[in-house]
């Protein structure tokens, strides 16, 4: 079992993740682990020498880079916020700020926009991943209501008047809650006819 550096006639290395082919010497050499970079290239008699990334820089993968990447903050102007800091082994982790969704994607999200409002009587369909797409508004299910224009308001169950020792004065709709009244209160005049029936 050869250890790097070793000769390779077919230009491939046994461990593609941790080794790379060096064409000048036609050998396989070790890559540097995450959080490090190549400080001295390999030769036929000496393997790659790696050094730790300096503060504020990183390399995420096994690599044969001669520099580390500079850490960059998430861009708040683009609607992004940080969920995890940059370390020597990973870049800053970003996501869309609350109430926003990813509108431009290039390997990662680069630009977030405000979620659109869902009108009364609807709510945003719950997604697997927050911030991945704009709201898709769906009607409140039976027995529920939502009375605002909002990107995040959820449909709530109608109040059950009997649970509060009250009686229903007006039924709930998708956009409004049930109206309850004291059982001893007289009905308003416009509703008294319906009671007589």
């Amino acid at each position: 079992q050869a250890v790097p550096p070793y000769a390779s006639e077919n230009q491939t290395c046994r461990d593609q993740e941790k080794e790379y082919y060096e064409p000048q010497h036609r050998i396989c050499c070790s890559r540097c682990p995450p959080g490090t970079y190549v400080s001295a290239k390999c030769s036929r008699i000496r393997d790659t020498v790696c050094a730790t990334c300096a503060e504020n820089s990183y390399n995420e993968h096994w690599n044969y880079l001669t520099i580390c990447q500079l850490c960059r903050p998430c861009d708040p102007v683009m609607g992004l916020e940080e969920i995890a800091p940059c370390t020597s082994k990973r870049k800053t982790q970003c996501r869309c700020q609350p109430g926003m969704f990813c509108a431009a994607w290039a390997l990662e999200c680069t630009h977030c926009e405000l979620l659109s409002d869902c009108p009364p009587g609807t709510e945003a369909e719950l997604k697997d991943e927050v911030g991945k797409g704009n709201n898709h508004c769906v009607p409140c299910k039976a027995g529920h209501f939502q009375n605002t224009s909002s990107p995040s308001a959820r449909c709530q169950p109608h109040t059950r008047c009997e649970n509060q020792g009250l009686v229903e004065a007006a039924p709930g709709t998708a956009q409004s809650d049930t109206t309850c009244k004291n059982p001893l209160e007289p009905l308003p005049p416009e509703m008294s006819g319906t009671m007589l029936m």
């Epitope: 504020n56 940080e82 800091p85």
Partner: antibody, heavy 116, light 107 residues
């Protein structure tokens, strides 16, 4: 060498605000995050939030959101932490710290006492 | 938020003793854990980052280990200047969180 010099101790009344400063030197102020952490004997160390002086953007711990404001003045390489609506539980030592895989550099701390 | 549960909360030991402090994260934090020493009236002192990397100037008797959720700080031979409170911290995700601290006292 990296130095973080903080303002002096403060005694405040409940309901008031306090503003603590942290002057940085020995490095490029705009390229490193500056955090604020507090220590109270009963509660241990608590992370409050950070500022990235390069774009003067701050992020906060939800626990302090609405009460804490972190700002920075690039011209003087100084960061500030203002805590409002003070209560007795805010009596603590407040530290600024520069981050990189933890907090390698800390200020000496500013003692804030909240008492009526 | 990620909880960092540190144990023990205090311990009594003698000069020369081997001391072990553990920290358990409520979820996987990789190796993104630091350890600090704090003495009354002083700023916390950074001892370890990346779970096991010892900062320059920190004596070799201090060592850190662990990954994922379980982490350990070991002082191989306790010295008089080591009597202090020790904290672990995760910097894997915001909000950063600390353990409650372990006070190392003289027996």
């Amino acid at each position: 060498q990296v130095q973080l010099v903080q303002s002096g101790a403060e005694v405040k009344k409940p309901g008031s605000s306090v503003k603590v400063s942290c002057k940085a030197s020995g490095y490029t102020f705009t390229t490193y995050y500056l955090h604020w952490v507090r220590y109270a004997p009963g509660q241990g160390l608590e992370w409050m939030g950070w500022i990235y002086p390069g774009n003067v953007h701050a992020q906060y711990n939800e626990k302090f959101k609405g009460r804490v404001t972190i700002t920075a003045d690039k011209s003087t390489s100084t960061a500030y932490m203002e805590l409002s609506s003070l209560r007795s539980e805010d009596t603590a030592v407040y530290y600024c710290a520069r981050s990189w895989e933890g907090f390698p550099y800390w200020g000496r701390g500013t003692t804030v006492t909240v008492s009526s | 938020d990620i909880q960092m549960t540190q144990s023990p909360s205090s311990l009594s030991a003698s000069v020369g003793d081997r001391v072990t402090i553990t920290c358990k994260a409520s979820q996987n934090v990789g190796i993104n854990v630091a350890w600090y020493q704090r003495k009354p009236g002083d700023a916390p002192k950074s001892l370890i980052s990346s779970a096991s990397y010892r900062y320059s100037g920190v004596p070799s008797r201090f060592s850190g280990s662990g990954s994922g959720t379980d982490f350990t700080l070991t002082i191989s031979s306790l010295q008089p200047e080591d009597f202090a409170t020790y904290f672990c911290q995760q910097y894997d995700t915001y909000p950063f969180t600390f353990g409650q601290g372990t006070k190392v006292e003289i027996k």
